[in-house]
Amino acid sequence: MKVLQEPTCVSDYMSISTCEWKMNGPTNCSTELRLLYQLVFLLSEAHTCIPENNGGAGCVCHLLMDDVVSADNYTLDLWAGQQLLWKGSFKPSEHVKPRAPGNLTVHTNVSDTLLLTWSNPYPPDNYLYNHLTYAVNIWSENDPADFRIYNVTYLEPSLRIAASTLKSGISYRARVRAWAQCYNTTWSEWSPSTKWHNSYREPFEQH
């Protein structure tokens, strides 16, 4: 039994890091493998993660961690029974993938303005809480070409757009994702999408 693709890990900079790897053949990850991880720290305790299958030869492990700080560094040991298959390390602050925003809502009752709001996925005491920026994706269910991205570079989790920038009388969907420049993170996953029917009064045209 050998590791074909070494574990790569990303952290949500809160309580979970996710490591993925591939074995050289079909593997029952949960019964055959264990990923041990330990904070490089005096007297720190070792933890064991039981991996799950992720495709035939792929494995994934969700490592539970205390709130992450930038100095944290973990040793990782991948075991198959008594055999050490791979040894490595992981610094969560250097491999951050933020949590996805939630509770995306489209408020259509403001006159001819669409107000999109969502929730910051972090509690106020987490470092990322005040460092997230967002991308909002809006698309038409009827027209695949009607697809747009709005970059929200301010901290408030909301976006206002004129309803007239979208076509009237058709349904749209929106979703939002986050990233943090401070840690040069990857983008989060997209939030679940939300749907609304866009309608507004066309301005009266005089001829």
Partner: antibody
Framework: EVKLVESGGGLVKPGGSLKLSCAAS????????MSWVRQTPEKRLEWVAS???????YYLDSVKGRFTISRDNARNILYLQVSSLRSEDTAMYYC?????????WGQGTLVTVSA | QIVLTQSPAIMSASPGDMVTISCSAS?????MYWYQQKPGSSPKPWIY???NLASGVPARFSGSGSGTSYSLTISSMEAEDAATYYC?????????FGAGTKLELK
């Protein structure tokens, strides 16, 4: 809820001995390193000894050879055997859950060394 | 051994003030821990691994720093924050504490 309760302190003459205990609950005791810390009457905090989850032990130089830290994982109890006591060992002794995760302290047990 | 020097030794602050307590290490450490102690009570873990708040600690507290320079900050002082604060290094044995900073209410 993590709980640490120290006991075993008391008044002892110089050169005497005591065995301090710390009863732990609310977490998997065997998985964590544990430590003893003391606070002198002048309110100075001083680390005394630690024991890892794998039973490795570490001591403050001034207590080496006189104090022994140990643990009973079956009963969830941390011990500190203190002997050849000196007046400078007079302090409130606290047990602590150590390691990288959130630390917890007990309420302490008082050791007074006096003739 | 690593010596921790806290400053100031004593300070007073009015309600609403921002308060910063410093802890300087004689050599570089990866993390700093902070404890709060009120008269007649045992020390309480307050901040661990530099910036994580212990359970029940109000969000007005924060910790920061790296290398040899660390600090505890209270964004807006409240009466209940009057106490003595100790820093501790967990970098190498022997584990050592600062002498404490006594924070009084003005």
């Amino acid at each position: 809820e993590v709980k640490l309760v120290e006991s075993g302190g008391g008044l002892v003459k110089p050169g005497g001995s005591l065995k301090l205990s710390c009863a732990a609950s609310g977490f998997t005791f065997s998985s964590y390193a544990m430590s003893w810390v003391r606070q002198t009457p002048e309110k100075r905090l001083e680390w005394v000894a630690s024991i890892s989850s794998g039973d490795s032990t570490y001591y403050l130089d001034s207590v080496k050879g006189r104090f022994t830290i140990s643990r009973d994982n079956a009963r969830n109890i941390l011990y500190l055997q203190v002997s050849s006591l000196r007046s400078e060992d007079t302090a409130m002794y606290y047990c602590e859950r150590s390691g990288g995760s959130a630390p917890y302290w007990g309420q302490g047990t008082l050791v007074t060394v006096s003739a | 051994q690593i010596v921790l020097t806290q400053s100031p030794a004593i300070m007073s602050a009015s309600p609403g003030d921002m308060v910063t307590i410093s802890c300087s290490a004689s050599s570089s450490v990866n993390y700093m821990y902070w404890y709060q102690q009120k008269p007649g009570s045992s020390p309480k873990p307050w901040i661990y691994r530099t910036s994580n708040l212990a359970s029940g600690v109000p969000a007005r507290f924060s910790g920061s720093g790296s290398g040899t320079s660390y600090s505890l900050t209270i964004s807006s002082m409240e009466a209940e924050d009057a106490a003595t604060y100790y820093c501790q290094q967990y970098h190498s044995f022997p584990l050592t504490f600062g002498a404490g900073t006594k924070l009084e209410l003005k």
